[in-house]
Interface confidence: medium
């Protein structure tokens, strides 16, 4: 069982590879990596590209075999693949590898770009869409304006971005975007740098994070009805869960995004 | 370990609110979903609503819109579901419930017990 | 809303024998998006299986789930004293619901 030897794929279809709770981690969470063959199988084996023998094994007399990662660190990280073998199949020979599964154990999802199209500048009676891109796709996308403690506008999207539509009377203002996978452990990725956009004739502007104090951070304001939501330049969230990558349909997000979004 | 510690039993009029709180220790609270599910005497269980603390969205049941409000402090990692205009329906424990494996609910607080009687 | 629709709504069986508990969904339910739980009187409900199929940390292997789109089972190959609850599924994939539940008493 050192290379596998991978025969046409009419004999031995490939399995399905799948990782939970998530295939985006942080560091020190348990990850379970099931592998499930379309027929009993004997042994089990995970494989990461460029290493010639499995890096586990689980022999099991049965459709699904699950490989236990506890507490992964980064180097951990990377692409999988699993193949399954039965006894009765020549030696090293193995079915159709799964398809790749990208585990990435980090602690925070990258920054996303917040753009304006068709541009941050907006004409009388125009409309403008904010599309806030990150780098994964079917996560959650949050818009934030300055001076509102809570989100704008909340959609899912199976691409790796999502756009917001603005109505033009109430577009010029200062906007922020995060995105965070879709269901829990929650966590979000660094927040986009602001853009501005403005009526014609106002000129727009990019502004670096630390030039918005007035933005507000993502979250209820604290229970104390004096206090102030802290400003988005000084939240820095932190760790990082994606969870399987489905999307999730939800009755009546708060705040609700307009009736023309098919929101999440 | 997470462990939910719910508020204890309330006796409320009808057309009244009632805010049951629930604490959480022994985790991450804020990064995680809390949900609330109620189950009225010898009935199912039915979804309320849930809220996400780090992102401070919440999420309701239609039946409940208008009616309940989820909230959270994530310097006490406790949360609060408040339910408005009480009937006598609406008699029932009241579970706070966190998911911590898909969204399946994996840790429930105790529950809390709220009748609605004049 | 996905409604859900449990059967039996009454099992009487006896510890050792197999249950065999039925959830059917009103509109196709992802698999990684169905619970099972169990719930015994003045009790919180425990959760069973998750994602159709995976069971929960400490649960015994007597219980496993399967099916997917509409039709789902769960399974407790060898009934112990302590299995006799009400057994309910979810769906979470959307607003979650949840069955009216399976109520598996002893015979």
């Known amino acids: 069982d050192i290379t596998p030897s991978v025969p046409p794929a009419s004999y031995h279809p490939k399995p399905w590879l799948g990782a939970q709770p998530a295939t985006v981690v942080t560091p020190g969470v348990n990850v379970t990596l099931r592998c499930r063959a379309p027929q009993p199988a004997w042994r089990f084996g995970l494989f990461k590209p460029g290493e010639i023998a499995p890096l586990l094994f689980r022999d099991v007399s049965s459709e699904l075999a699950e490989f236990f990662l506890e507490e992964v660190t980064p180097a951990q990280g990377g692409i999988y693949r699993c193949c399954y073998r039965r006894p009765d199949w020549g030696p090293g020979v193995w079915s159709q590898p799964s398809d790749v599964l990208e585990l990435l154990v980090t602690e925070e999802l990258p920054r996303p770009s917040l753009v304006a199209l068709p541009g941050p500048v907006v004409g009388p009676g125009a409309n403008v869409s904010l599309r806030c891109a990150g780098r994964l796709r079917n996560m959650s996308f949050v818009l934030y304006r300055e001076g509102v403690a809570a989100p704008l506008q909340y959609r899912h999207s199976a691409q790796p971005w999502a756009d917001f539509t603005l109505l033009g009377a109430r577009a010029p203002g200062t906007y922020s975007c995060y995105y965070h996978t879709p269901s829990a452990p929650y966590v979000l990725s660094q927040r986009s740098e602001v853009l501005v956009i403005s009526w014609e004739g106002e000129g727009p502007e990019a502004r670096p994070a630390s030039s918005a104090p007035g933005m507000q951070a993502p979250g209820p304001p604290p229970s104390d009805p004096g206090a102030q939501a802290p400003s988005l330049s000084s939240f820095r969230p932190r760790g990082l869960v994606l969870q399987p990558l489905l999307p999730q349909t939800q009755d009546s997000w708060d705040p609700a995004p307009p009736p023309s979004d098919p929101g999440v | 370990q997470v462990q939910l510690v719910q508020s204890g039993a309330e006796v409320k009029k009808p057309g009244s609110s009632v805010k049951v709180s629930c604490k959480a220790s022994g985790g991450t609270f804020s990064s995680y979903a809390i949900s609330w599910v109620r189950q009225a005497p010898g009935q199912g269980l039915e979804w309320m609503g849930k809220?996400?603390?780090?992102?401070?969205?919440?999420n309701y049941a239609q039946k409940f819109q208008g009616r309940v409000t989820i909230t959270a402090d994530k310097s006490t990692s406790t949360a609060y579901m408040e339910l408005s205009s009480l009937r006598s329906e609406d008699t029932a424990v009241y579970y706070c419930?966190?998911?911590?494996?898909?969204?399946?609910?994996?840790?429930w607080g105790q529950g809390t017990m709220v009748t609605v009687s004049s | 809303e996905i409604v859900l629709t449990q059967s039996p709504g009454t099992l009487s069986l006896s510890p050792g024998e197999r249950a065999t508990l039925s959830c059917r969904a009103s509109?196709?339910?992802?698999?990684?998006?169905l619970a099972w739980y169990q719930q015994k009187p003045g009790q919180a409900p425990r959760l069973l299986i998750y994602?159709?199929?995976s069971r929960a940390t400490g649960i015994p292997d007597r219980f496993s789930g399967s099916g997917s789109g509409t039709d789902f089972t769960l399974t407790i190959s060898r009934l112990e004293p302590e299995d006799f609850a009400v057994y309910y599924c979810q769906q979470y994939g959307s607003s979650p619901t949840f069955g009216p539940g399976t109520k598996v008493d002893i015979k």
């Open positions: 994602g159709a199929s």
């Open positions: 509109q196709s339910v992802s698999s990684s998006y």
């Open positions: 419930a966190n998911p911590l494996t898909f969204d399946a609910f994996d840790i």
């Open positions: 809220i996400i603390p780090i992102l401070g969205i919440t």
